[in-house]
C-alpha cells in the first residue's frame, strides 16, 4: 500500500518518463543557479513536500537529487541563512521502510547524515549546515533541479 | 482556532534558572516553526529562538546563546525554553509565536508570561 | 545583523485621518518585510506580511509598501481601536529583527 506522497512521486516520475526527448541543455536558464553539471532553483516561497514536487515538475525539473556528502555540501554552500530549510527529492517509503529519492533508488546511509525520525510522513530537507527529517506537511522552500547534459555534436547527411 | 498559552514565568535571581512552557492547540503543531520573542518592561519586541517543526533544528539570538535552549514535544502540542543563568538583562514578557524560519511571519501569538530577574 | 529604524517613534492623530508609518532597512530585505500592532497589555497582532499582503481578518484600511529598503505601513482612515504601536520586522535574515515601534496615539 503506498502512500499518497509515494504515488505522487511515483506519478510525476512516471509521466516525465513519458514526455518526449528534450534537447539537451546547454545552460542554466535565468533565475537558475549552476553547481557543476546541474542547474538548481531555489524557491522564495514556502510549500509543503507535495507541492514542491510538484512545482518542480511544472518547471520540467525534479526535486533535487544528491549523489552523494561533496553534493551536498557544495549545494549547502549556496543557501545564504542558516534559518532557511529547503525539501530536497527524498522521503520515507513507508512500504519499503527506508529513504528513498524521487528517481525511485533508496539512501545510500553514508551519503547523508539525518538528524530525526525515519517515519511516515517524513521527509528530508536540508539547512546551510545539516539535513533535517521533517513532517512533509510543513511548508518550507524547496531546490528544483535541471540536468545539464552534454550534447555531442550531431553529423548531418549533405543535403 | 489557533491558541498558544504560555506558562512558567517568575521571579528568579541573577543566575538562577527557569523554564517556560507554550501549549499549543487549534492546528498540526508538528508542521510549525514555532520562537520566543521577548518584551522588556517598556521595550520593543526582540526575537529570541526557533524550532523547525521536528525539533531537529534550533537558532538563537547572540544574546541568549549558550543560556537558553528551545525544544518541543510534538506529542504534548508543547514548545519550551529552558533559560539558565538568567541576567537582569532578560527581564521581559516571554511570548511563544507561530514561526520562525525564513521567510516565516509569526502569524499568531500567546498572551506572554513576565519573567523578573533580580535580587 | 540587519537594523530596522521606524519613523516617527510616535504620532498624534484623530479618528478619520490618514496614517503613514515608514520602516528603514540597514540593506536590502527584498520583500521580506511584516507589520504587527500592539496595544498595551496585550501581544502583538499579526497585519501584513510580504510588504504589502494584507493578513486574513485583518480590515482593508491597513496597507503596506515598499522592497528593498524602504517601506511604509498606512492606515487610511484611523479608527478608534487602532491607536497602538506599531512594529515592522524582517524575515530576511537572522537575526529576526523588528523596528523599535511606532506609537499612534489619540490628538
Known amino acids: 500500500q503506498k502512500s499518497s506522497i509515494e504515488k505522487c512521486s511515483v506519478d510525476i516520475q512516471q509521466s516525465r518518463n513519458k514526455t518526449t526527448e528534450r534537447p539537451g541543455l546547454l545552460n542554466c536558464p535565468i533565475y537558475w543557479q549552476q553547481l557543476r553539471e546541474k542547474c538548481l532553483l531555489f524557491s522564495h516561497t514556502v510549500n509543503p513536500w507535495n507541492n514542491s514536487l510538484a512545482d518542480c515538475s511544472t518547471k520540467e525539473s525534479s526535486l533535487l537529487l544528491i549523489r552523494d556528502k561533496d553534493e551536498l555540501i557544495h549545494t549547502q554552500n549556496l543557501i545564504r541563512d542558516k534559518a532557511i530549510l529547503f525539501w530536497i527529492g527524498l522521503n520515507f517509503s513507508l512500504s519499503e521502510k527506508n529513504w528513498k529519492w524521487i528517481n525511485g533508488s533508496f539512501l545510500n546511509s553514508n551519503d547523508l547524515e539525518i538528524r530525526g525520525d525515519a517515519k511516515e510522513n517524513s521527509c528530508i530537507s536540508i539547512s546551510q549546515t545539516s539535513v533535517y527529517s521533517e513532517y512533509c506537511s510543513t511548508e518550507i522552500r524547496w531546490i528544483c533541479q535541471k540536468e545539464l547534459t552534454p550534447v555531442r555534436n550531431k553529423v548531418y547527411p549533405d543535403s | 482556532e489557533v491558541q498558544l498559552v504560555e506558562s512558567g514565568g517568575g521571579l528568579v535571581q541573577p543566575g538562577g534558572s527557569l523554564r517556560l512552557s507554550c501549549a499549543a492547540s487549534?492546528?498540526?503543531?508538528?508542521?510549525?516553526?514555532m520562537s520566543w520573542v521577548r518584551q522588556a518592561p517598556g521595550k520593543g519586541l526582540e526575537w529570541v529562538s526557533a524550532i523547525s517543526g521536528s525539533g531537529g533544528s534550533t537558532y538563537y539570538a547572540d544574546s541568549v546563546k549558550g543560556r537558553f535552549t528551545i525544544s518541543r514535544d510534538n506529542s504534548k502540542n508543547t514548545l519550551y525554553l529552558q533559560m539558565n543563568s538568567l541576567r537582569a538583562e532578560d527581564t521581559a514578557v516571554y511570548y511563544c509565536a507561530r514561526g520562525g524560519y525564513l521567510p516565516d511571519a509569526f502569524d499568531y501569538w500567546g498572551q506572554g508570561t513576565l519573567v523578573t530577574v533580580s535580587s | 545583523d540587519i537594523q530596522m529604524t521606524q519613523s516617527p517613534s510616535s504620532l498624534s492623530a484623530s479618528v478619520g485621518d490618514r496614517v503613514t508609518i515608514t520602516c528603514r532597512a540597514s540593506?536590502?530585505?527584498?520583500?521580506?518585510l511584516n507589520w504587527y500592532q500592539q496595544k498595551p497589555g496585550k501581544a502583538p497582532r499579526f497585519l501584513i506580511y510580504?510588504?504589502?499582503s494584507l493578513q486574513s481578518g485583518v480590515p482593508s484600511r491597513f496597507s503596506g509598501s515598499g522592497s528593498g529598503t524602504d517601506f511604509t505601513l498606512t492606515i487610511s482612515s484611523l479608527q478608534p481601536e487602532d491607536f497602538a504601536t506599531y512594529y515592522c520586522?524582517?524575515?530576511?535574515?537572522?537575526?529576526?529583527?523588528f523596528g523599535q515601534g511606532t506609537k499612534v496615539e489619540i490628538k
Open positions: 520586522q524582517q524575515t530576511y535574515s537572522t537575526p529576526l529583527t
Open positions: 510580504a510588504a504589502s
Open positions: 540593506q536590502s530585505i527584498s520583500s521580506y
Open positions: 487549534g492546528f498540526t503543531f508538528s508542521s510549525y516553526a
